[in-house]
């Protein structure tokens, strides 16, 4: 082609028209084009209808094109990936009718201030949605209802002050949630539902530690090993979980998971008032509970965690184990850190290893090239995640360009993955990192393999194992510019359980007393 570079790889015909100072779609492109790169041009406005002749088009990169308007007309029946990051869009086009097969949508780093009701209607195949770096203050109720297959959601670096209580309802495959660097002060009760969320990025928000935060505290404790800090330029493999990164804004950066909740209403003699009644549509069967677990089976008793009552307010083992400073650097928009796929039942990790064909393009902002999906611990045969199909472990798209490192840097201070629970009011034998046991379970962290027979292991939650798990790896998707939920090698660090809606959770985590 006279203007663009055409290459054929296997059955894909890739056309690279990046950085050609184009103001419109070049004429006479090959009709069987499957991947089209139009990044870093000067399109300003673009009509998807102009691509209708390209009936095999599966990936379209329109990032960094100074787009202020995207006209959605016609239909691109097989387009699966659309990158609109780093443009000037002030509203999200209604893509459902035009792009019914869309699986990855990246609208990061635009100028979105709000999303309309039904913004995602018709996008029933969507698996990854990247909205990082916009100016969103609120989200419409039911925003994600049309996207039940969603696996990765990045809302990082916006101005969100609150989240709809049912935002995640029905998202049984969600394995990566990036909410860092917003203005969130609390999490609605039951927000996370009953599924294990393998990778959660929650730091950089002004969490208000009062009685309303107890549900979130319990959730953090239950999911301590699934909470990470995003850092640009750090290989996902180097990431470790750091539940202490979620800090009270009103208490000198005290970790939310250790907030004592003294004086808060209790149910009976203990426990928060938000019991089961707040459980959002729990999947009691657990068909789709995601749980990241490293699969090394430990002795049954796995020495009681030293934490005994792990949450004792005074105990700081978790904190000490985790990096204290957690402000991640800017995420590179295109870092392709791959996240370990969510563990699926039988540890068949379906990490859809969808590597975006979209080749990371070096754009004005260099973004790390996608690294290979981070090794995922081998799934434990028994563990099932409630339905987590590993979602592609791809860096969150269009995070701000970061150096090529695809995996987020470890939190400011890499927190050792404390395998041994910190002692709590009642010291339980601190299980030092459990020894891997023969029973394969999803090995999320390199050291700890949960011998979870069916524990749902988050796709990447415990990807602490440095050795790639064949299953996981095979299932991983590498997504360029993922907010980079780094290939979180979930180093089990926080041994805190966060219980969300857990009726049993006593509000005063501060002092977990032995049962």
């Amino acid at each position: 082609h006279p203007i663009c570079e055409v290459s054929k790889v296997a059955s894909h015909l890739e056309v690279n028209c990046d950085k050609r100072n184009l103001t419109a779609l070049p004429p006479d492109l090959p009709k069987d084009t499957t991947i089209l790169h139009l990044s870093e041009n000067l399109l300003y406005t673009f009509s998807l209808a102009t691509l209708m002749p390209y009936t095999r088009l599966t990936q379209l990169n329109l990032d960094r094109c100074e787009l202020t308007k995207l006209q959605v007309d016609g239909t691109l029946p097989v387009l699966g990936t659309l990158d609109l990051s780093h443009n000037q869009l002030q509203s999200l086009p209604l893509l459902g009718q035009t792009l019914p097969a869309l699986t990855v949508l990246d609208v990061s780093f635009n100028r979105l201030t709000s999303l309309p009701l039904g913004a995602l209607r018709g996008l029933g195949e969507l698996q990854e949605l990247y909205l990082k770096g916009n100016e969103l203050k609120t989200l419409p109720p039911g925003l994600l209802t049309p996207t039940p297959k969603l696996e990765k959601l990045s809302l990082a670096n916006n101005n969100l002050t609150e989240l709809p209580a049912g935002l995640l309802n029905g998202l049984e495959n969600l394995d990566t949630l990036l909410l860092q660097e917003n203005s969130l002060y609390t999490i609605p009760k039951g927000f996370f539902g009953s599924h294990l969320l393998p990778f959660a990025f929650l730091h950089g928000n002004p969490w208000l530690c009062n009685c309303e935060i107890l549900y979130f505290r319990r959730w953090l404790q239950d999911n301590a090993e699934n909470v990470y800090v995003w850092k640009q330029g750090v290989d996902v493999k180097a990431m470790t979980s750091n539940v202490a990164s979620v800090q009270c804004d009103n208490s000198d950066k005290f970790p939310v998971y250790k907030y004592p909740g003294k004086g808060c209403p209790t149910l009976g003699d203990e426990g928060d008032t938000d019991l089961y009644d707040y459980y959002p549509e729990e999947d009691t069967e657990g068909d789709k509970v995601r749980a990241t677990r490293t699969v090394v089976k430990f002795p049954t008793k796995a020495h009681t965690t030293p934490w005994g009552l792990f949450y004792s307010w005074s105990t700081a083992s978790l904190d000490s184990q985790m990096p204290s400073s957690l402000h991640p650097t800017q995420e590179s928009t295109k870092e392709q850190t791959t996240f370990p796929p969510r563990w699926t039942p039988n540890f068949t990790l379906h990490m859809e290893s969808i590597t975006f064909s979209k080749t990371p393009k070096s754009t004005t902002e260099p973004t790390p090239s996608p690294t290979t999906s981070e090794p995922v611990p081998e799934p434990a045969p028994n563990m099932t995640t409630l339905e987590p199909t590993p979602s592609p472990t791809t860096p969150e798209p269009t995070s701000e360009p970061a150096p090529s490192p695809t995996t987020p840097e470890p939190t400011s201070e890499p927190a050792p993955s404390p395998t041994t629970p910190e002692p709590t009011s009642e010291p339980a034998p601190s299980p030092t990192t459990p020894e891997p046991t023969p029973i394969p379970t999803i090995a999320t962290s390199p050291t700890i393999l949960v011998s979870a027979t069916s524990l749902i292991t988050p796709k990447s939650t415990f990807l602490t194992t440095t050795k790639p798990v064949s299953l996981l790896e095979s299932t991983k998707k590498t997504i360029p510019e993922l907010d980079q939920p780094p290939k979180l090698r979930g180093v089990l660090q926080g041994h805190l359980e966060s219980s969300r809606n857990d009726p049993f959770l006593h509000p005063d985590f501060c002092c977990l007393l032995p049962l």
């Epitope: 239950d222 090993e225 009976g268 677990r293 629970p421 459990p434 524990l455 359980e497 966060s498 219980s499």
Partner: nanobody, 123 residues
Framework: EVQLVESGGGLVQAGGSLRLSCAAS????????MGWFRQAPGKERESVTA???????LYADSMKGRITISRDNAKNTVYLQMNSLTPDDTAVYYC?????????????????EGQGTQVTVSS
Amino acid sequence: EVQLVESGGGLVQAGGSLRLSCAASRRTFSNYVMGWFRQAPGKERESVTAIGRSGTILYADSMKGRITISRDNAKNTVYLQMNSLTPDDTAVYYCAASSGSMQQFWRMEYDYEGQGTQVTVSS
């Protein structure tokens, strides 16, 4: 010392159901991840299910879709409903409590565990 007492086990025919209960002696029950593991004769222990303080739930693949865990903090009790039982489900079922995370529980890092209740599924 926390005491965990299981009940509800017994002999059932293949395809049948059982509901196991685990009563805890302390009111601090809500501070723990609770769940069940099992051990069949000549086999290693395996995690069956767990429920966190916040309601996060994990199930083993081998019993996925056939079991449901729930807890009643007011009664300091956790329940395991098992349906469509097969002879392979024959084992001693133990209740356990962990003050750590869900992952720790799944790794069998328990603070407390009960004496177990026998479940026998005949063909």
